[in-house]
């Protein structure tokens, strides 16, 4: 219950007729009219977020104090999210400052900043993001501050903008008295307010049934101020575990609901895959086969490990294999799925198998993968490979079984030719190569690609059935990049590494040198 409120100033009720002072004139705060709920409403607004060094003031008219000694200032306002502007508007702010000044007379339009004392920086609980703005959902913040004791005949309030996008929809100033109070699940009796400014009566509160002072917390106490308002709440009562706050009382959690600690939160419905709880439950047990990871909140459903990756393919591409899979059909109810890839190689002749992690290269680390594909390279020809992809989530460690799928692939591509420079002159290079005899029968031709080093725009290709070639019509004293690749009926074999060979300079003595 609130005390009697005696209103001294109400901007929203004045219908835009108050005519507050803006400084600098015409640059910052602006009185706007808008339509809300089919009703015209007035607001003071400012939105100079793209310019730095803003110092825009809005001052109320002079307010007669009367008998008030401590005043309460209730602000209703909206603040736009700085991130809703392009580039985040680097000079944009999301707060404004509240000031007051006391005086025995109305200064009219004579505004002097130095007379004002800061009450507080006002920050919103909720900022208006782009979607709210577009949908015209005004995220209205309500903040209340108090000032006192006041001693002069009247006062002004002032609002300083330092670069926010803010609209003040309501400014209400009032003073009040102390009723019987039920707050924070503590009951405070009606209290006569002291008559002197320093006189604050300390009143002890009593926790309602099934509410307790939280561990380490203070006993609930409040102070009744001269203006009739309860001030400075100390301590609080919270509903014990298994109970939730309903209006001003603590009520047992209904069957199927739980609350696991002394807190302000309500009872939560037992999450999925838990057993039904009795009335007043403090937790909900997991169904058989379902688990909670240590970091899972009690409010999260119990979950289980995922099934195996749904579909796994291994596509050979020369000496590489691309593994692709789809997520498990059953995620276990979790989103923290990761994948691990392991590799086994088998020699076809002996049938002997062993791990191959050290001899292959993965496109990214093969453990803790979040993507559903990986490329494995540096595979050996004439070798059979088996890849295993395992799916895991946050509760996989709580069971011994694993969820995996395997795929096998044979590597048939020829080995890269081993290339040698047999001889060179000022205008030619003689090159030879070899590949293992068992693979030679599969080779149809060899393709020799060469180009000047540093010239990426053109290259030359020679094809031959033999194991050597002389490259003619070359430039003297020039380095050439040479690569040899076997061509088979299945396509291109692995290319040799790119060699750098240099022709002789015209001054070179011999016509042939190795």
């Amino acid at each position: 219950a609130q005390g009697k409120e005696v209103v001294l100033l109400d901007f929203a009720a004045a219908g835009g007729e108050l005519g507050w002072l803006t400084h600098p004139y015409g640059k910052g705060w602006d009185l706007m009219q808008n339509i809300m709920n089919d009703m015209p409403i007035y607001m003071y607004s400012v939105c100079n977020v793209m310019s730095g060094d803003q110092d825009n003031w809005l001052r109320t008219n002079w307010v007669y104090r009367g008998e008030a000694e401590r005043i309460f200032i209730e602000l209703k306002f909206t603040v736009r999210d700085c991130n809703s502007f392009p580039g985040g508007a680097s000079s944009c702010k999301e707060t404004f400052n509240l000031y007051y000044a006391e005086s025995d007379l109305d200064y009219g339009t004579n505004f002097q900043k130095r007379l004002f004392t800061k009450i507080d920086t006002i920050a919103p609980d909720e900022i208006t993001v782009s979607s709210d703005f577009e949908a015209r959902h005004v995220k209205l913040n309500v903040e209340e501050r108090s000032v006192g004791p006041l001693t002069r005949k009247g006062f002004y309030l002032a609002f300083q903008d330092i670069g926010a996008c803010v609209a003040l929809l309501s400014v209400r100033v009032y003073y009040k008295k102390c009723p019987e109070l039920l707050q924070s699940l503590a009951r405070f009796p009606e209290t006569i307010a002291g008559s002197d400014a320093p006189s604050l009566a300390t009143v002890a509160g009593t926790c309602v049934d099934h509410a307790v002072v939280p561990p380490g917390g203070e006993e609930p106490r409040m102070h009744c101020a001269v203006d009739g308002e309860w001030l400075v709440p100390i301590g609080q009562c919270l509903c014990q575990a298994g109970y939730e706050k309903v209006e001003d009382a603590c009520q047992a959690c209904s069957p199927g609901f739980f609350k696991f600690e002394v807190s302000e939160s309500p009872c939560l419905e037992c999450p999925e895959h838990t057993l039904p709880s009795p009335e007043g439950a403090t937790s909900c047990e997991c169904e058989e086969g379902f688990f909670r990871a240590p970091q899972d909140p009690m409010s999260m459903p119990c979950t289980r490990p995922p099934s195996a990756p749904h579909y796994l393919t291994a596509v050979g591409m020369g000496a590489k294999v691309e593994l692709r899979w789809t997520p498990p059909q059953d995620s276990g109810g979790r989103e923290d799925i990761v994948y691990s890839v392991t590799c086994e190689q088998c020699w076809p002749e002996s049938g002997e198998c062993g791990p191959c992690e050290s001899s292959v290269r993965y496109s990214e680390p093969p453990h803790g993968l979040t993507r559903t594909s990986v490329t494995v390279s540096d595979l050996e020809p004439h070798m059979n490979y088996t890849f295993t992809v395992e799916a895991r989530n946050g509760v996989s460690g709580l069971v011994t079984s694993r969820s995996f799928r395997t795929a096998s692939v044979s590597i048939n591509q020829t080995e890269p030719p081993k290339v040698r420079l047999e001889g060179r002159s000022t205008t030619s290079l003689s090159v030879s190569w070899s590949i293992p005899p068992p693979q030679q029968s599969r080779v149809w031709k060899y393709e020799v690609t060469y180009r000047k080093k540093g010239d990426s725009n053109s290259y030359n290709v020679r094809r031959t059935e033999g194991f050597s070639v002389t490259l003619d019509d070359l430039a003297p004293d020039t380095t050439y990049l040479v690569q040899v690749q076997a061509l088979t009926q299945e396509g291109q074999g692995a290319g040799s590494k790119v060699h750098e060979f240099q022709t002789l300079s015209p001054e070179g003595s011999g016509s042939l040198a190795v």
Partner: antibody, heavy 128, light 107 residues
């Protein structure tokens, strides 16, 4: 760079139908309110219809209510205007226009919108 | 619907001139008013919104003022690129009506 490209205009007989499209690129289409504005030959601008960023709400000028339907497909970055029961007075260049709240430096949105970005327009001629 | 009336309907001016166009609303629209520039055969371009806010990239020689029912667009020093037709638009109501336009021609 924001680009809006209208298509689908042409000659149609009174009572006929046309469907205009507006292909958007260079911005996040699903963040924008979109609208159609028309301009009869030698005349001023007339707002026709608008649609919210996610497909609603929609508003129409009285002159087209019940005959025109605005829609959008955010997956295709495209705005549409289905025009039925066309009349001679619907003859105009039809512009697709957009509004992004990020460039609207006000604390509370206006009761309606203005138009920050415009397409080049497509001509609709209704004549027998 | 809210009616928007622009004046003059056309004006002749020289490069460097200060030009002011006015727009009157048939009822109060607070400051919910935008100004656009349109050249022949081209789409309109936004200049000003909320009566006085300059749209991104618009030269500072353009300025807007007014609230309630009386508004004006001022070009402080007319440039060759500014010869065009200018429209005001209210967005205080869902009808989003435009003025009839003011054509700025070379004297």
């Amino acid at each position: 760079e924001v680009q809006l490209l209208e298509s689908g205009g042409g000659l149609v007989q009174p009572g006929g139908s046309l469907r205009l499209s507006c292909a958007a690129s260079g911005f996040t289409f699903s963040h924008y309110m979109m609208a159609w504005v028309r301009q009869a030959p030698g005349k001023g601008l007339e707002w026709v219809s608008r649609i919210g960023p996610s497909g609603g709400p929609t508003h129409y000028a009285d002159s087209v209510k019940g005959r025109f339907t605005i829609s959008r497909d955010n997956s295709k970055n495209t705005l549409y205007l289905q025009m039925n029961s066309l009349r001679a007075e619907d003859t105009a260049v039809y512009y697709c226009a957009g509004y992004d709240s990020g460039y609207d430096y006000v604390a509370v949105a206006g009761p309606a919108e203005y138009f920050q970005h415009w397409g080049q327009g497509t001509l609709v001629t209704v004549s027998s | 619907d809210i009616q928007m009336t622009q004046s003059p309907s056309s004006l002749s001016a020289s490069v460097g001139d200060r030009v002011t166009i006015t727009c009157r609303a048939s009822q109060s629209i607070s400051t919910w008013l935008a100004w656009y520039q349109q050249k022949p055969g081209k789409a309109p371009k936004l200049l000003i919104y909320k009566a006085s806010n300059l749209h991104t990239g618009v030269p500072s020689r353009f300025s807007g003022s007014g609230s309630g029912t009386e508004f004006s667009l001022t070009i402080s020093s007319l440039q060759p690129d500014d010869f065009a037709t200018y429209y005001c638009q209210q967005y205080n109501s869902y009808s989003r009506t435009f003025g009839q336009g003011t054509k700025v021609e070379i004297k």
